[in-house]
């Protein structure tokens, strides 16, 4: 394994980070922030990448489906938590192709730095990010709940994952920002459910000494749809795009899928219809089962030990911050817009610390900060009691969940002895079956002077596709050492965030 | 390897819409990569006009946001390109092509098809 | 939008010959400078990707350098074959090309 020049490995960096955003389910995109190191291995005709990304949250659902790079800047009337992360990715691509690269695993750790950057000392507005956000379930159930009324096509829709809450304290009242998942539960159940997934971001406002907040003076919800199902035409014709259908009083993807179709088989979408989806293809077949079979290329991953999974991580306080990792078929989005104007014209960047009371627990007694060397952790646990979890991604959610036996996957890897197998609040321990590609870990708050703790490089060994020896792993272990000519440049416009990471300025 | 091949009509009257159809063999494109629309003026001069990911998500040229769309029928492994309200201006031989990641670099081309705008 | 330069529009050299042909952006463009041929009949092809590297399929007597905002696509020894428009486009932000630079047998 050989060091090599951060900036000669952008694009395989920007590919990579695309690819481990398309394996995740819930959370935000990763944008890329700097190549912090890399090194590369030279195995017959295939190039092994072992790449350390610094990354930042952005504030697009990774639902969206969206390249990190096109996620527009957030809405400035609304707190943008700054969540930091680093990623370890073990990468291929054949040598000669250019459009060719694969993600083998990656490992991420983020951290919120929102209350390390705040400067609260002149501010009239006081703005907190709750790391416990299920406590702000009620809140979203009751946006939710809200949008139902104005949007029948959301009838069936749950409140999934409760992703990130602000509140805001100034002169004119107090508002908590609320952006959660939601997932399609339709009562009738079909040998599949259709796999829809949304996005809302709730902004529910009550008066300075409110404590009731069970009733909010004022409520703005947004939701977007991302549908697994296709949202195209017929005849390749395009509608018209003067004249956008509507339906239900807000605009929609103009076309869809008839509802329960066999395959193939496409009407145009009628405006007025009510709005129902098929349900999607088995988990690993990404579309291809319309039409006739292509020649594929590579996959963006390579196929995982199960075919739908999900990482859960677990606090001791029983919240869960899990990441999906399932590699399923396309998601489309249709934005649905709420008629209600945002009430208060306060500006609230002004920082903010964070409830500390909050904080998830560290389960083994040493402090979450300490630098690990490395990147591994005391114990040979996951940093701060995350660990992986797998099971059928489309039968988990709000939704009732299946059966235990009904898992389609994975094999033998437990959590380590002793730890819990806690799903969330309500749910019964459910087996761990296998050893999932890639993870991401949220880890608590950063404070000022505190760096993020690398994510562990302890990958299992891989055999390499198409390789001669394919009993023979051929990924090295993770280098410890930094690239020469590493870390690259930070990307214009994150210059507040690059204290928290290590090796923070050029060689 | 991937091949693109270009389809529509060469002839468009000025104020309607044009469409293209670019059909895509050798390669799915639900699997990887961004497919692209771009055109060549009269005289040579290349314009970037938007792509569709493999993901389904969409990014345009900012100068034809208003007019542009780009969509896709993965059944028939097939990208469209809407234009509305087109002119004279138009004009132009369009190519689809395909780019690893964006617009980064287009690896493969389509042959590209003429469309004249004339009344 | 970052514009991109081809200063010479039209070159003549002999068969054989080493051919440079240099492409100026107006900003950094940290190594997104590719570069394309485009034949008489329209075919276009990617040479060259990210600066310096060869597309799979492509001669190496074809290379690429540069850096910042100056770019170069060397032709070691000229071909008949290699007569065509070559075209450099940047690709770190939205996608400009240059005005192309037509190569012809003197």
């Known amino acids: 394994v050989s060091p090599t020049d951060c900036s000669a490995v952008e694009p395989e960096a920007e590919k990579a980070l695309d690819l481990i955003n398309k394996r995740r389910r819930d959370g935000y995109l990763f944008q890329l922030l700097r190549i912090a190191d890399a090194h590369l291995d030279r195995v017959e005709n295939t190039t092994v990448y072992y790449l350390v990304l610094d990354v930042q949250e952005s504030d697009c659902s990774v639902l969206s489906r969206k390249y990190w790079n096109d996620c527009e800047p957030p809405d400035s009337r609304r707190p943008s938590e700054i969540v930091i992360g680093q990623c370890k990715v073990i990468a291929t691509r054949h040598s000669h192709e250019s459009q060719d690269l694969r993600v083998i695993d990656f490992n991420c750790t983020t951290s919120s730095v929102s209350s390390a950057l705040a400067n609260t000392k002149d501010s009239p507005v006081l703005i907190d990010f709750f790391e416990d956000t299920e406590r702000y379930r009620k809140q979203a159930n009751k946006a939710l709940e809200k949008y139902k009324e104005e949007n029948d096509d959301f009838a069936s829709f749950r409140v999934d994952r409760i992703e990130r809450v602000a509140r805001v304290r100034g002169g004119e009242g107090t508002g908590y920002f609320v952006d959660f998942s939601v997932r399609n539960c339709p009562r009738h159940h079909f040998p599949r459910h259709p796999n829809v997934f949304g996005f809302c971001r709730a902004d529910l406002f009550y008066d300075v000494e409110a404590l009731d907040l069970e009733s909010p003076k004022n409520l703005v919800i947004n939701c977007e749809v991302f549908d697994p199902q296709e949202h195209e035409n017929i005849n390749g014709v395009p509608p018209h795009l003067g004249h956008p259908f509507h339906w239900g009083g807000h605009e929609r993807s103009s076309t869809t899928k008839p509802p329960f179709k066999p395959h193939g088989s496409r009407d145009h979408h009628h405006p007025h219809k009510p709005h129902e989806h098929g349900p999607p293809p088995p988990p690993d077949e990404r579309d291809h089962s319309h039409g006739p079979p292509l020649p594929q290329g590579p996959p963006p991953l390579l196929p995982m030990s199960c075919s739908s999974c999900q990482h859960a991580t677990f606090g001791t306080n029983g919240a869960q911050r899990h990441s999906h990792n399932n590699n399923s078929s396309d998601l489309h989005p249709h934005k649905h817009h709420s008629h209600e104007q945002h009430p208060h014209g306060h500006h609230p960047h002004a920082h903010h610390p964070h409830e500390h009371d909050t904080h998830r627990q560290h389960p083994h007694g040493h402090h979450p900060h300490g630098h690990h060397p490395h990147g591994h952790h005391p114990h040979g646990h996951h940093p701060h009691g995350h660990h992986p979890h797998c099971h059928d991604f489309q039968d988990y959610g709000p939704c009732d969940p299946p059966p235990h036996n009904q898992g389609h996957c994975c094999h033998g890897h437990g959590p380590p002895p002793g730890h819990l197998r806690r799903r969330g609040p309500g749910k019964g321990p459910r087996p761990f079956h296998c050893r999932q590609i890639g993870s991401v870990y949220r880890l608590p708050p950063l404070r000022k002077g505190e760096v993020l703790p690398l994510p562990e490089a302890n990958f299992p060994s891989f055999p390499l596709p198409h390789h001669k020896h394919p009993l023979k792993p051929d990924n090295q272990p993770f280098p410890q050492s930094v690239s020469e000519s590493c870390p690259g440049k930070f990307k214009s416009g994150f210059p507040q965030v690059s204290m928290f990471f290590t090796h923070t300025f050029p060689k | 390897e991937v091949q693109l091949q270009e389809s529509g009509p060469g002839l468009v009257k000025p104020s309607q819409s044009l469409s293209l159809t670019c059909t895509v063999t050798g390669y799915s494109i639900t699997s990887d990569y961004a497919w692209n629309w771009i055109r060549q003026f009269p005289g040579n001069k290349l314009e970037w006009m938007g792509y569709?990911?493999?993901?389904?998500?969409?990014n345009y040229n900012p100068s034809l946001r208003s007019r542009i769309s780009i969509t896709r029928d993965t059944s028939k492994n097939q990208f469209f390109l809407q234009l509305i309200s087109v002119t004279t201006e138009d004009t132009a031989t369009y190519y689809c092509g395909s780019a690893s990641y964006r617009y980064a670099w287009f690896a493969y081309w389509g042959q590209g098809t003429l469309v004249t705008v004339s009344a | 939008d970052i514009q991109v330069t081809q200063t010479t529009s039209s070159l003549s050299a002999s068969l054989g010959d080493r051919v440079t042909i240099s492409c100026r952006a107006s900003?950094?463009?940290?190594?997104?400078l590719n570069w394309y041929q485009q034949k008489p009949d329209g075919t276009v092809k990617l040479l060259i990707y990210y600066t310096s590297r060869l597309h799979s399929g492509v001669p190496s007597r074809f290379s690429g350098s540069g850096s910042g905002t100056d770019y170069s696509l060397t032709i070691s020894n000229l071909e008949q074959e290699d007569i065509a428009t070559y075209f450099c486009?940047?690709?770190?932000?939205?996608?400009?090309f240059g005005g192309g630079t037509k190569l012809e047998i003197k």
């Open positions: 569709i990911s493999y993901s389904g998500s969409t």
């Open positions: 900003q950094d463009i940290s190594n997104y």
């Open positions: 486009q940047q690709g770190n932000t939205l996608p400009t």
